[in-house]
């Protein structure tokens, strides 16, 4: 079957995000991928969206992330914009209202996004073949 247009949009956004280095991409988020053996694909997407939403809600106006220079400010704003877009698209793909995120494990946002990109690319290669 054809790949969902949302999936392509997610991969495009993740490509942009993983190229970015900002003051806050080294901050930690809940690592939902650490123990996701018994988790459905939809649950994984829903939980990933939840983690991203928690991150940008908490750090959108964080002065440490906004930095002191214009470049740092704009890079952070761009990061938040992409995270919101990713969050929106992941919810669309998940089709779930809510999902629990209880893991204790942490990873940097940078590593979290790289892992998510790998998962999305694998999904894309399956649906496009």
């Amino acid at each position: 079957h054809k790949c969902d247009i949302t999936l392509q949009e997610i991969i495009k956004t993740l490509n942009s995000l993983t190229e970015q280095k900002t003051l806050c991409t080294e901050l930690t988020v809940t690592d939902i991928f650490a123990a996701s053996k018994n988790t459905t694909e939809k649950e994984t997407f829903c939980r990933a969206a939840t983690v991203l939403r928690q991150f940008y809600s908490h750090h959108e106006k964080d002065t440490r992330c906004l930095g002191a220079t214009a470049q740092q400010f704009h890079r952070h704003k761009q990061l938040i914009r992409f995270l919101k877009r990713l969050d929106r698209n992941l919810w669309g793909l998940a089709g779930l209202n809510s999902c629990p995120v209880k893991e204790a494990n942490q990873s940097t946002l940078e590593n979290f996004l790289e892992r998510l990109k790998t998962i999305m690319r694998e999904k894309y290669s399956k649906c496009s073949s």
């Epitope: 970015q20 002191a68 220079t69 214009a70 470049q71 400010f73 704009h74 914009r81």
Partner: antibody
Framework: QVQLQQSGPQLVRPGTSVKISCKAS????????IHWIKQRPGQGLEWIGM????????RLNQRFKDRATLTVDRSSSTAYMQLRSPTSEDSALYYC????????????????WGAGTTVTVSS | DIQMNQSPASLSVSLGDTITLTCHAS??????LSWFQQSPGNIPKLLIY???NLHTGVPSRFSGSGSGTGFTLTISSLQPEDIATYYC?????????FGGGTKLEIK
């Protein structure tokens, strides 16, 4: 082509309010911050502030924080600047300009400017 | 706020001259500097961004250099259309600030 079209000249009374517009065309309006610049007759340029058309977030120069309001109307790709309680010091040419960025802000600059709106404050 | 100082404030020139305008920042701005040209009655026109990058369509007789706190704009073989006021602008941190300008006048 990329254009910023500003509203016409305005004559306003001291202590009232003035609102000028800047209509964008030829590019994705929500992708670039719009900045506002003031130029008094025969003088230099002064940065007033900026607005992100995608979400309406603003950042203002402290000197204008209490009197300037920046807004956007995404449906018409138009940015607005309102100046409250103007005095003769506010008689100036006001420009809107777009902040163009490349490579995740590896470089950025004002590449396109509106023609400017002349505001005259007089009783 | 970062202060930007330009010198000289005005300069008497002859067509064909090579001239250098200077801009000094009150603190380190790395290479976050733009140069603009403004002819009487016209809008500012971007010439140089990030200290030394020539904007699209700008003649190669314009060149910029510098980093940190000291910057220069050089115009070689001055043409009639170059008679204008030149402004530097720092893009290092908000609020963005401009120099007072250097006005070119024909001798």
């Amino acid at each position: 082509q990329v254009q910023l079209q500003q509203s016409g000249p305005q004559l306003v009374r001291p202590g009232t309010s003035v609102k000028i517009s800047c209509k964008a065309s030829g590019y994705s309006f929500t992708s670039y911050w719009i900045h506002w610049i003031k130029q008094r007759p025969g003088q230099g340029l002064e940065w007033i502030g900026m607005i992100d058309p995608s979400d309406g977030e603003t950042r203002l120069n402290q000197r204008f924080k209490d009197r300037a309001t920046l807004t956007v109307d995404r449906s018409s790709s138009t940015a607005y600047m309102q100046l409250r309680s103007p005095t003769s010091e506010d008689s100036a040419l006001y420009y809107c300009t777009r902040l163009k960025e490349y490579g995740n802000y590896d470089s950025f600059y004002f590449d396109v400017w509106g023609a400017g709106t002349t505001v005259t404050v007089s009783s | 706020d970062i202060q930007m100082n330009q010198s000289p404030a005005s300069l008497s020139v002859s067509l064909g001259d090579t001239i250098t305008l200077t801009c000094h920042a009150s603190q380190n701005i790395d290479v976050w500097l733009s140069w603009f040209q403004q002819s009487p009655g016209n809008i500012p026109k971007l010439l140089i961004y990030k200290a030394s990058n020539l904007h699209t369509g700008v003649p190669s007789r314009f060149s910029g250099s510098g980093s940190g706190t000291g910057f220069t704009l050089t115009i070689s073989s001055l043409q009639p259309e170059d008679i204008a006021t030149y402004y530097c602008q720092q893009a290092h941190s908000y609020p963005f600030t401009f120099g007072g300008g250097t006005k070119l006048e024909i001798k």
